[in-house]
Amino acid sequence: EKSDLRTVAPASSLNVRFDSRTMNLSWDCQENTTFSKCFLTDKKNRVVEPRLSNNECSCTFREICLHEGVTFEVHVNTSQRGFQQKLLYPNSGREGTAAQNFSCFIYNADLMNCTWARGPTAPRDVQYFLYIRNSKRRREIRCPYYIQDSGTHVGCHLDNLSGLTSRNYFLVNGTSREIGIQFFDSLLDTKKIERFNPPSNVTVRCNTTHCLVRWKQPRTYQKLSYLDFQYQLDVHRKNTQPGTENLLINVSGDLENRYNFPSSEPRAKHSVKIRAADVRILNWSSWSEAIEFGSDDGHHHHHH
């Protein structure tokens, strides 16, 4: 489990405490409070300041990571005096025992895999557990299917992403009978971790002078409009000399995805394949299966 807390202030002052499960920082309410604020500072000198709760004696953080260690701070003014208290939140347990090389990716629009490696100093009996919360912290998902290596959990497969939002909090806790295990946590945007399938329903229609390629945008986990897609077409003439460059064409997403290019008869055999990406990320999907068109005698006009 996550670490104990050390306060840097007289113990009598505010009695600041932090609950990592709810991300709630609270302190003893003071009479005649005129001003209060809470915030944290992380190792990158990032300051995160949430809104105070209605009772003004607690606040709940949303978009924060804790594994590198953070310092919470509470400032309270009353009509009589001012209070300030810091709370160091270290990642207790032996250094190097936390899960490392953590990554997740969403694929096929509704599946997700997360993987990690055991910490280099973790004992043989270490066991890791993954918990996921959406960034609003309203729901916790426990890993339903672990991927194991010699009995140690080193990954997780999810086939129900309904509890996720656009940004999610991932926590890998560790346990051991021998020593304390550090935790690892991360905030991941679904935008960054989704891997698109290649475009579907790729067709090529040719007339005497042109060929028209059409395709459908891939189904995605994120709710995206056609404007969010970028495509790359690889139009390749068959039987060319090795080392001949393929023609790579960039096409922006449209309501109806199509690319029309000049190609007169008789038409040599060509192939076309397409891949997709989010315009703001450019994490390319794999290529669609190659569709062939044209022929050595130039008689074929329509290809699926």
Epitope: K44, R46, V47, E49, R62, E63, S135, K136, Q230, R280
Partner: antibody, heavy 123, light 107 residues
Framework: QMQLVQSGAEVKKPGASVKVSCKVS????????IHWVRQAPGKGLEWMGG????????NYAQKSQGRVTMTGDTSTDTAYLELSSLRSEDTALYYC????????????????WGQGTLVTVSS | EIVMTQSPATLSLSPGERATLSCRAS??????LAWYQQKPGQAPRLLIY???SRATGIPDRFSGSGSGTDFTLTISRLEPEDFAVYYC?????????FGQGTKLEIK
Amino acid sequence: QMQLVQSGAEVKKPGASVKVSCKVSGHTLTELSIHWVRQAPGKGLEWMGGFDPEDGETNYAQKSQGRVTMTGDTSTDTAYLELSSLRSEDTALYYCATGRYCSTDTCYGFDYWGQGTLVTVSS
Amino acid sequence: EIVMTQSPATLSLSPGERATLSCRASQSVSSYLAWYQQKPGQAPRLLIYGASSRATGIPDRFSGSGSGTDFTLTISRLEPEDFAVYYCQQYNNWPPTFGQGTKLEIK
């Protein structure tokens, strides 16, 4: 189409405070994260921080600590940047900005910008 | 934080010419890069995101390329309205950071 309209120019004395507003139209404030970017005269752009009006969380660099407050009024779809203990080096154009895909710590490109508010700090 | 360095600081060209602006990141930002245009007295305008995708309404004479640490904004044929200051910005790592700008001026 989304628009961000900022309040007018301000001239302040050192040590004073200023509150710049950014009125959103074409969207409700709670759907957005509002970011503030400043530009000193003749200089480049500097990200100051981001604010989530729905849950009130602010994310900013430590050098802004204690002097910068970002707030929002969801009833009027207006975001605010308050700067206290003003110094001459705070003289700058202050822009609010947002994008189609944002959180409090960044945007995947700032698609929409206010027109800027010039704050001049001079004794 | 990631430092974005733009070059040249000033580029003097004539309308009709091709402009090539460079931006280098102090560490890899993948393709998480945007370009902005700013004219005097105006707010910046988003031109490119994802290193190479044009924002809505941006003419196709503007193109972006690169990934990792080295990026280029190219304006194929300069129009009189293209003379402005151009900024690159990374959104891969916190905090988001901008380059110091390249001023594109009429020769």
